[in-house]
């Protein structure tokens, strides 16, 4: 079958990284610069996307494979394809609509993105608090008094940090 | 907070040329693409093409060159498009819409543009 | 250019029925955006890169997909998801967007 239709269709031989050429007798002609073609037999190559403003440039543009970009410093990437690039907030901040805004008391965010939270509830584990929580940190949850005990231990984990999936609409 | 704002409504003749302007604010102008987009009434959404205003670089649909062209003006944040020797099939509402790799959420108003004799 | 198709081109749902709605692409690209339009509005962003939900969408939206075929899904219909939904294609320039797909509520 390839060679069927490789005899019918001379683009079919053109290789990724080349065009074929309908100006030039359907030869192969190599991707002019600042484009690609990732698969064989193409009649046009495709324009290179460019690393611009809040992105930068993280695997350049080759003849056979689109650019792929990041985020400049500052910024961080939502979505697994980095298609956005979202403003990176301080520790014990969020980003709103407004810009990055303190989290509210009771909350708060170790990162530099994502949403403030709120301080774990010891009471509700039956804990008592044994370091207060701030805008940057979680509370540490520390055993009750009646826990106490040699060897028991006195701390326990903050709650994970979660993903927020947030965008920046 | 981030805002688009395009330009009011136009009624031209054919065969006549218009501007349409997006007045951006609450972000960095050039650190960001602007698109164009058409929507004839009752259809489907078409892209036109995209300038970064930071140095003016801009992609094309092919469909539309020779009849957009797009500019942008970094000192009034403001991105244009011009549609040249226009047509009925011009007749649409064209949207602006802040570009990252995408088109990222942030979209203008409209403006209806008629093409009528 | 890359060609998005989406179906159906018509539907329509009664409150909290699940709706699922699908974009074909002519050839394989990473990521697709949803959108949502209503009558006299501009297109809002539901979800990017596939499957990543935007700022403010109910968590009834959810997207998913790879390689050619893509689908947007609604897990219980509600009277305001009445509208247009559009997939759209930034991978490779032009960027495209599907035909769309009007839900109407029962």
């Known amino acids: 079958f390839e060679r069927t239709r490789s005899l019918q269709d001379p683009c079919s031989n053109c290789p990724a990284g080349t065009f074929c050429d309908n100006n030039r007798n359907q030869i192969c002609s190599p991707c002019p610069p600042n484009s690609f073609s990732s698969a064989g037999g193409q009649r046009t190559c495709d324009i290179c996307r460019q690393c611009k403003g809040v992105f930068r440039t993280r695997k350049e543009c080759s003849s056979t494979s689109n650019a792929e970009c990041d985020c400049t410093p500052g910024f961080h990437c939502l979505g697994a394809g980095c298609s956005m690039c979202e403003q990176d907030c301080k520790q014990g901040q969020e980003l709103t609509k407004k810009g990055c805004k303190d989290c509210c008391f009771g909350t708060f965010n170790d990162q530099k993105r994502g949403i403030c939270r709120p301080w774990t509830n010891c009471s509700l584990d039956g804990k008592s608090v044994l370091v207060n929580g701030t805008k940057e940190r979680d509370v540490v949850c520390g055993p009750s008094p009646a826990d106490l005990s040699p060897g028991a231990s006195s701390v326990t984990p903050p709650a994970p940090a979660r993903e927020p999936g947030h965008s920046p609409q | 907070e981030v805002k688009l704002v395009e330009s009011g409504a136009e009624l031209v003749r054919p065969g006549s040329s218009v501007k349409i302007s997006c007045k951006a604010s609450?972000?960095?102008?050039?650190?960001?693409?602007m698109n164009w987009v058409k929507q004839r009434p009752g259809q489907g959404l078409e892209w036109i093409g995209q300038?970064?205003?930071?140095?003016?670089?801009?992609n094309y649909n092919g469909k539309f060159k020779g009849k957009a062209t797009l500019t942008a003006d970094k000192s009034s944040s403001t991105a244009y498009m011009q549609l040249s020797s226009l047509t009925s099939e011009d007749s649409a509402v064209y949207f602006c819409?802040?570009?990252?790799?995408?088109?990222?959420?942030?979209w203008g108003q409209g403006t209806t543009l008629t093409v009528s004799s | 250019q890359i060609v998005l198709t989406q179906s159906p081109a018509i539907m329509s749902a009664s409150p909290g029925e699940k709706v699922t709605m699908t974009c074909s692409a002519s050839s394989s690209v990473s990521y697709i955006y949803w959108y949502q339009q209503k009558p006299g509005s501009s297109p809002r962003l539901l979800i990017y890169d596939t499957s990543n939900l935007a700022s403010g969408v109910p968590v009834r939206f959810s997207g998913s997909g790879s390689g050619t075929s893509y689908s947007l899904t609604i897990s219980r219909m509600e009277a305001e998801d009445a509208a247009t939904y559009y997939c759209q294609q930034w991978n490779i320039y032009p960027y495209t967007f599907g035909g769309g797909t009007k839900l109407e509520i029962k």
């Open positions: 819409a802040r570009g990252q790799l995408g088109l990222d959420g942030y």
């Open positions: 609450g972000y960095a102008f050039s650190l960001y693409w």
């Open positions: 300038i970064y205003p930071g140095d003016g670089y801009t």
